[in-house]
Interface confidence: medium
């Protein structure tokens, strides 16, 4: 079998064998090597010479196989925009940011650029769980049967109603979507407002 060409090699159809790690250089009609993540093009290829790559300097990065002549500058997560760092910048990866707790991404351009405070969910509701935290504003859904939530909050979850019998108590008032069950000692008299009803 014929040996595989090593970059730089001529390409008449403007395509290269390995699209990820090679690129077509139209000036010379050749395929040249891309530089691996964490590096940049230090010297461009020619008919004789393949691309020469060099490591990105501190505080800069290139994430992909590339033919960039510079590395991208690492940028911090901007707290003014509601962002916080979850992983530092490396030569191969930009700083990883996310919205601060209690915030959601309000502006997205390939990555989140601006976070805003999550809306409160009123009593009797909770924020619908999302696949990814901070991806969107709260969508409030009613507490399911047997659960309650009694605050206006962006993050409070509906809790199950207390089962009085589990505590050796009896139910004094049933729970609602906005309040927990009221329990009482079985030997205690009923509250005054309920006593008339009981006598009847």
């Amino acid at each position: 079998s014929q040996p595989q060409a090593v970059p730089p090699y001529a390409s008449e159809n403007q395509t290269c064998r390995d699209q990820e790690k090679e690129y077509y250089e139209p000036q010379h009609r050749i395929c040249c090597s891309r530089c691996p993540p964490g590096t940049y093009v230090s010297a461009k290829c020619s008919r004789i010479r393949d691309t020469v790559c060099a490591t990105c300097a501190e505080n800069s990065y290139n994430e992909h196989w590339n033919y960039l002549t510079i590395c991208q500058l690492c940028r911090p997560c901007d707290p003014v925009m509601g962002l916080e760092e979850i992983a530092p910048c490396t030569s191969k990866r930009k700083t990883q940011c996310r919205c601060q707790p209690g915030m959601f991404c309000a502006a997205w351009a390939l990555e989140c650029t601006h976070c805003e405070l999550l809306s409160d969910c009123p009593p009797g509701t909770e924020a619908e769980l999302k696949d990814e935290v901070g991806k969107g504003n709260n969508h409030c859904v009613p507490c399911k049967a047997g659960h309650f939530q009694n605050t206006s909050s962006p993050s409070a979850r509906c809790q199950p109603h207390t089962r009085c019998e589990n505590q050796g108590l009896v139910e004094a008032a049933p729970g609602t979507a906005q309040s927990d069950t009221t329990c009482k000692n079985p030997l205690e008299p009923l509250p005054p407002e309920m006593s008339g009803t009981m006598l009847m």
């Epitope: 230090s42 010297a43 010479r49």
Partner: antibody, heavy 120, light 110 residues
Framework: QVQLQESGPGLVKPSQTLSLTCTVS??????????WSWIRQHPGKGLEWIGF???????YYNPSLQSRVTISVDTSKNQFSLKLNSVTAADTAVYYC????????????WGQGTMVTVSS | QSALTQPASVSGSPGQSITISCTGT?????????VSWYQQHPGKAPKFMIY???VRPSGVSNRFSGSKSGNTAYLTISGLQAEDEADYYC??????????FGGGTKLTVL
């Protein structure tokens, strides 16, 4: 601006090794993009490309000379060097060092050249 | 590989135009737009004049121009001046991953 200056013995005995150095001034040999080259010119004749080097040590040689030639670089001295072994009278020539345009293989800046005679 | 073929000499009077040819083969001049030209005055180093057949580096007079047809590249000098008197060399990439120069042309300004 960048200037190049060749230096080395003007007379070398047959079968010995020809050694020349090119000193780069007015700029860094480690500048991104620039390869550096040796070219020679036989008396009264045309030019012959010998090879390229990058400051990282990457080299490319003329296939007809590859078995005898070594080009090296010393970034601390801003110099690159040529060694040509097993020389004969046919290696008598003016030897030039030159800078290579990024992404091209054309020689934009040349040294003034140094004459090397191979004779016993 | 053999050198590219250039005429040994050409001449012209001041103000005239002259053209120097550089003939190669299908595997060098004919295949690639990678021809460069160099001017060399006696006892001096070559000077870079043209690359990629037609591209003139900054600082080189626009009286110098390059072209190519088939396997032959051309250097044209218009409005010939006394200081243009020199040797001119073409250079081309060849398939064997090397570079080859022409034998040189002596230009005489009459």
């Amino acid at each position: 601006q960048v200037q190049l200056q060749e230096s080395g013995p003007g007379l070398v005995k047959p079968s010995q090794t020809l050694s020349l150095t090119c000193t780069v001034s007015g700029g860094s040999i480690s500048s991104d993009g620039y390869f550096w080259s040796w070219i020679r010119q036989h008396p009264g004749k045309g030019l012959e490309w010998i090879g390229f080097i990058y400051f990282t040590g990457i080299t490319y040689y003329n296939p007809s000379l590859q078995s005898r030639v070594t080009i090296s670089v010393d970034t601390s001295k801003n110099q690159f060097s040529l060694k040509l072994n097993s020389v004969t009278a046919a290696d008598t020539a003016v030897y030039y060092c030159a800078r290579v345009i990024p992404g091209e293989d054309a020689f934009d800046i040349w040294g003034q050249g140094t004459m090397v005679t191979v004779s016993s | 590989q053999s050198a590219l073929t250039q005429p040994a000499s050409v001449s012209g009077s001041p103000g005239q135009s002259i053209t120097i040819s550089c003939t190669g083969t299908n595997s060098d001049v004919g295949s690639y737009n990678l021809v460069s030209w160099y001017q060399q005055h006696p006892g001096k180093a070559p000077k870079f004049m043209i690359y990629e057949v037609t591209v003139r580096p900054s600082g080189v007079s626009n009286r110098f121009s390059g072209s190519k047809s088939g396997n032959t590249a051309y250097l044209t000098i218009s409005g010939l001046q006394a200081e243009d008197e020199a040797d001119y060399y073409c250079c081309s990439y060849v398939d064997s991953k090397t570079w080859v120069f022409g034998g040189g042309t002596k230009l005489t300004v009459l």
